[in-house]
Interface confidence: medium
């Protein structure tokens, strides 16, 4: 649902769900490609594996990934790239059971950060070919402009 | 980053990251000392192991701690002390694997609470000498005035 | 605490804690009955096992459940029922240790969603007779109107 702003005082929001997840052959990471499920305001733009910040400011960011993987620890890193540098904002880490039938954990984290115009926000799983569940209610990413 | 308020309608926010963590000898707790990473508004003040509320109101509070400990369960308790009593607001609990290489879990929780002027907010890990990872993107504490 | 609104610009909020949790005999689910711990505004109404949305809009929803259960995976599903259909908004999943003394995990998740007038929000644990800890700082549910 894309909502129009009735008044300036409303918060811009963006809630994204996965399209797919891929690993580059030469990289020990898995990236998620996102699509909007809910958008209010125009300050944020989904762009493939990232989200572009068009309206600088202070945002509440949240991220959840649902893992189905027996790798001993799994998790995601939320980072921003802009002004020529990359910065990790927050990460979530979950120890996983070694038995495949039990290896099922969601990992949620969130925080408030100042984002700059032109920043690209992304969610990275620092594992090649990570086994994720891309259900929209298990894996998602969100922004609220404060 | 310390931000100035362009207009009164903006939310006061404070995002804190660790300086260090210590345990008192006579108590089975570990406390975290905090420093601001992002601040907007003046209603919240980091004070060593606590955060003083200078502007009463309803706040979204969030807390994450990154544990590297084989103690069977780990977690943090977020509480407020004020008006002569202490109150637990919320807690996060995580069972930990017994193998040190796997014992790596972040624990995130959050909620909305009414805080009073003069309240001191703190994050307690009810374990002495808890093994924490004090990376600013793994362990943090935050407030948003609603 | 029920707070009055000093001005229209304040966010409506509702933070709920458990009264009890029950399983219907013929159903493989456990439901939680909620009571308000903090309320500001009139747009949300606790109704037994659900929360009725009286004021449509975009909300930050959060949910935590504290599990004390050796069932291999535990978790909660937050869903809305309205306009003749049910929709899962988000879920939290946690693998549990098989030893009862270690089987202790909180599961937190949250997200931003558009809720319609008349929607009923509920938290379901898709396990019959799930062993939950109903401490108000371990299991809770919350809403912030954005």
């Amino acid at each position: 649902a894309v909502l129009t702003q009735k008044q300036k005082k409303q918060h811009s929001v963006l809630h994204l769900v996965p399209i797919n997840a891929t690993s580059k052959d030469d990289s020990d990471v898995t990236e998620v490609m996102w699509q909007p499920a809910l958008r209010r305001g125009r300050g944020l733009q989904a762009q493939g594996y990232g989200v572009r910040i068009q309206d600088a400011g202070v945002y509440l960011l949240y991220s959840q990934v649902l893992f189905q993987d027996v790798t001993f620890t799994m998790g995601q890193v939320v980072s921003r790239e802009g002004q020529g540098r990359q910065e990790t904002l927050f990460r979530c880490i979950r120890s996983m059971p070694s038995h495949p039938d039990r290896a099922y954990n969601s990992c949620y984290s969130a925080g408030v950060f100042h984002l700059h115009q032109g920043d690209i926000l992304s969610v990275i799983i620092p594992r090649a070919r990570a086994k994720l569940n891309l259900s929209p209610h298990g894996t998602f990413l969100g922004f609220v402009k404060l | 980053a310390v931000l100035t308020q362009k207009q009164k309608k903006q939310h006061s926010v404070l995002h804190l990251v660790p300086i260090n963590a210590t345990s008192k000898d006579d108590s089975d707790v570990t406390e975290v000392m905090w420093q601001p990473a992002l601040r907007r508004g003046r209603g919240l003040q980091a004070q060593g192991y606590g955060v003083r509320i200078q502007d009463a109101g309803v706040y979204l509070l969030y807390s994450q701690v990154l544990f590297q400990d084989v103690t069977f369960t780990m977690g943090q308790v977020v509480s407020r002390e004020g008006q002569g009593r202490q109150e637990t607001l919320f807690r996060c609990i995580r069972s930990m694997p017994s193998h040190p290489d796997r014992a790596y879990n972040s624990c995130y929780s959050a909620g909305v609470f009414h805080l009073h002027q003069g309240d001191i907010l703190s994050v307690i890990i009810p374990r002495a000498r808890a093994k924490l990872n004090l990376s600013p993107h793994g362990t943090f504490l935050g407030f948003v005035k609603l | 605490a029920v707070l009055t609104q000093k001005q229209k610009k304040q966010h409506s909020v509702l933070h709920l804690v458990p009264i009890n949790a029950t399983s219907k005999d013929d159903s493989d689910v456990t439901e939680v009955m909620w009571q308000p711990a903090l309320r500001r505004g009139r747009g949300l109404q606790a109704q037994g096992y659900g929360v009725r949305i009286q004021d449509a809009g975009v909300y930050l929803l959060y949910s935590q459940v504290l599990f004390q259960d050796v069932t291999f995976t535990m978790g909660q599903v937050v869903s809305r029922e309205g306009q003749g259909r049910q929709e899962t908004l988000f879920r939290c999943i946690r693998s549990m240790p098989s030893h009862p003394d270690r089987a202790y995990n909180s599961c937190y998740s949250a997200g931003v969603f558009h809720l319609h007038q008349g929607d009923i929000l509920s938290v379901i644990i898709p396990r019959a007779r799930a062993k939950l800890n109903l401490s108000p700082h371990g299991t809770f549910l919350g809403f912030v109107k954005l």
């Epitope: - | 089975d28 609990i93 009810p126 374990r127 002495a128 | 003394d101 800890n133 401490s135 299991t139």
Partner: antibody, heavy 121, light 107 residues
Framework: QVQLVQSGAEVKKPGASVKVSCKAS????????MHWVRQAPGQGLEWMGY????????KYNEKFKGRVTMTRDTSISTAYMELSRLRSDDTAVYYC??????????????WGQGTTVTVSS | DIVMTQSPSTLSASVGDRVTITCKAS??????VAWYQQKPGKAPKLLIS???NRDSGVPSRFSGSGSGTEFTLTISSLQPDDFATYFC?????????FGQGTKLEIK
């Protein structure tokens, strides 16, 4: 099977100290906290605190802070509770009790047989 | 400190009776309440934890219920071995506190 065996009865004078021991067997000593609870004659139960054998860290009831010391010796799976500056109203049966795990949110599932401490001049 | 108020203080009943003991907490303690049975000269024995979970080996005639501030221990059909003193305890907030006890005696 889990057993907690406490030391024998003690008679002490006011102002003295008493140290009660509690030997655990049948489980991994460092995986559970050990609570201490006392019961004055004909009265109810009063929680004094606990020792976490995993990290040798105590948690005391504020009422007893400064007078109580809880310790442990993991090599012999034994917990100790020492109460100083004894008064006549400290006359009670002192119990050790195993905490079911993480101290908060867990009940006390196994109890020692109790140690009678009598404070009399 | 949280006050746990038990009632009644004394209860007279007969074998086969159904009896109920209540415990009220001075503030919300979730379901972090235990019930113990104590016989004269003996240590307390855990019956119920988490308000309603029977400990292993405890007969099914013992049941617990409640959450928040009001809790109940019910013995569905009294047996001769059940005449004892019963204590509730909250373990939600330090310091842990006990009720003053209910003495169950033969009528």
């Amino acid at each position: 099977q889990v057993q907690l065996v406490q030391s024998g009865a003690e008679v002490k004078k006011p102002g003295a100290s008493v140290k009660v021991s509690c030997k655990a067997s049948g489980y991994t000593f460092t995986s559970y906290v050990m609570h201490w609870v006392r019961q004055a004659p004909g009265q109810g139960l009063e929680w004094m605190g606990y020792i976490n054998p995993y990290n040798d860290a105590p948690k005391y009831n504020e009422k007893f802070k400064g007078r109580v010391t809880m310790t442990r010796d993991t090599s012999i799976s034994t917990a100790y509770m020492e109460l100083s500056r004894l008064r006549s109203d400290d006359t009670a049966v002192y119990y050790c009790a195993r905490g079911l795990g993480y101290a908060l949110y867990y009940a006390m599932d196994y109890w020692g047989q109790g140690t009678t401490v009598t404070v009399s001049s | 400190d949280i006050v746990m108020t038990q009632s009644p203080s004394t209860l007279s009943a007969s074998v086969g009776d159904r009896v109920t003991i209540t415990c009220k907490a001075s503030q919300n303690v979730g379901n972090n309440v235990a019930w113990y049975q104590q016989k004269p000269g003996k240590a307390p024995k855990l019956l119920i934890s988490s308000a309603s979970n029977r400990d292993s080996g405890v007969p099914s005639r013992f049941s617990g219920s409640g959450s928040g501030t009001e809790f109940t221990l019910t013995i569905s059909s009294l047996q001769p071995d059940d005449f004892a003193t019963y204590f509730c305890q909250q373990y939600n907030i330090y310091p842990f506190t006990f009720g003053q006890g209910t003495k169950l005696e033969i009528k």
